[in-house]
């Protein structure tokens, strides 16, 4: 299986909400001993590999933000913990999964990693990730709403607040 990022860069004004999105696709083993976890964490542009370092998002770890199920089922976190931090992660039946961040501040700027982990027999893990950058801007240079820049082309797209 693979993970694709729809957008590689999100530029947002302070105070706005944004939804970062990834897509999980490819052959999926729906065996009873296989579980998929989808989650998010912050990272930095590593010298060796992007997303190799992991840090919490607004003090929440990847385990606080994860969705887990077998195959391509829909799921979402409505945990009080995440919502108290202005965060919500969700996924649909088509392999899309996202994290919504509310009331952005400059401190939210940085590299975000989406991750899919396949676990067999509750032991070994196989993982694939995607990366995207969030730039939160303030002042006269900030856009009026979030602008998302596609991963594969230079065309930008205005995205509505979540």
């Amino acid at each position: 299986f693979k993970v694709a990022t729809l957008y590689s860069l999100y530029v947002c004004p302070e105070g706005q909400n944004v939804t970062l999105t990834c897509r999980f696709f490819g052959p999926v083993d729906k065996g009873h001993d296989v579980t998929f976890y989808k989650t998010w964490y912050r990272s930095s542009r590593g010298e060796v590999q992007t997303c190799s370092e992991r840090r919490p998002i607004r003090n929440l770890t990847f385990q606080d933000l994860h969705l887990h199920h077998g195959g391509h089922q829909a799921a979402n976190t409505s945990h009080d913990l995440a919502q108290r931090h202005g965060l919500e992660s969700a996924s649909d039946h088509h392999g899309n999964f996202s994290i919504t961040m509310r009331n952005l501040t400059l401190l939210d700027s940085g590299l975000y990693c989406c991750l899919v982990v396949e676990i067999r027999h509750h032991h070994s893990e196989h993982r694939v990730h995607g990366a995207m950058e969030l730039q939160v801007q303030t002042g006269k240079d900030a856009p009026s709403s979030c602008v998302a820049y596609p991963s594969s082309s230079q065309e930008s797209e205005n995205i509505t607040a979540a």
Epitope: D29, Y37, T39, Y41, E53, R54, R55, P56, T61, F62, Q63, D64, L115, V117, E118, I119, R120, H121, H122, H123, S124, E125, H126, R127
Partner: antibody
Framework: QVQLVQSGAEVKKPGASVKVSCKAS????????INWVRQAPGQGLEWIAR????????YYNEKFKDRATLTVDKSTSTAYMELSSLRSEDTAVYYC??????????????WGQGTTVTVSS | NIMMTQSPATLSVSPGERATLSCKSS????????????LAWYQQKPGQAPRLLIY???TRESGVPDRFSGSGSGTEFTLTISSLQSEDFAVYYC????????FGGGTKVEIK
């Protein structure tokens, strides 16, 4: 740089308990598992247990589940392993080690310097 | 539990020579989903903690000299040190992380 620094050597009597600490620095402590591994004199490595500091959830080798207790103090980025009902065969060097897994198992990329625990009457 | 067996227990080698260390697992540590072998090698010198050398059976950890190489798949693995330096005399452990964690008994590489 990423570092794990352990507490000093301990000498204990049989039946007592020992609590070893492992202080992490240079990375986000809450987001990586901490494992405990021991090595008896002249012997190989034996995995005891691990803990995810973000949640405090711990996972134990069956052999140690009744005697080992793992805890963390997130405010000081410190992990602890307490081993109770000590016997002479628990004499060993105890290591903490970080692993890079998310939900499964992974290799150990960073190790503490080790804490020698001697159990003797 | 997956059992790990290392051989020989002790290997006597002269500096500059090649050392070949063996590790066998009681069941395959190859994961079908990604075709990776969940096996690592560590080096341990007297009075020191183990140090990660190789993971995924053949990937060198950052900073590890290229005279160290890992090979093998499934249940049989080899760590090769192409030309032994004085600092390479140590004990080497293999470690499977496919299903919980188990280590081999170690191979001591000593000066001949």
């Amino acid at each position: 740089q990423v570092q794990l620094v352990q507490s000093g050597a301990e000498v204990k009597k049989p039946g007592a308990s020992v609590k070893v600490s492992c202080k992490a620095s240079g990375y986000s402590f809450t987001d990586y598992y901490i494992n405990w591994v021991r090595q008896a004199p002249g012997q190989g490595l034996e995995w005891i247990a691990r803990i995810f500091p973000g949640s405090g959830n711990a996972y134990y080798n069956e052999k140690f589940k009744d005697r080992a207790t793992l805890t963390v103090d997130k405010s000081t980025s410190t992990a602890y392993m307490e081993l109770s009902s000590l016997r002479s065969e628990d004499t060993a060097v105890y290591y903490c080690a970080r692993d890079d897994s998310f939900y499964g198992y992974w290799y150990f990329d960073v190790w503490g310097q080790g804490t020698t625990v001697t159990v003797s009457s | 539990n997956i059992m790990m067996t290392q051989s020989p227990a002790t290997l006597s080698v002269s500096p500059g020579e090649r050392a070949t260390l063996s590790c066998k697992s009681s069941q395959s540590v190859l994961y079908s989903s990604n075709q990776k072998n969940y096996l690592a090698w560590y080096q341990q010198k007297p009075g020191q903690a183990p140090r990660l050398l190789i993971y995924w059976a053949s990937t060198r950890e950052s900073g590890v000299p290229d005279r160290f190489s890992g090979s093998g798949s499934g249940t049989e693995f080899t760590l090769t040190i192409s030309s032994l330096q004085s600092e390479d005399f140590a004990v080497y452990y293999c470690h499977q992380y496919l299903s919980s964690y188990t280590f081999g008994g170690g191979t001591k590489v000593e000066i001949k």
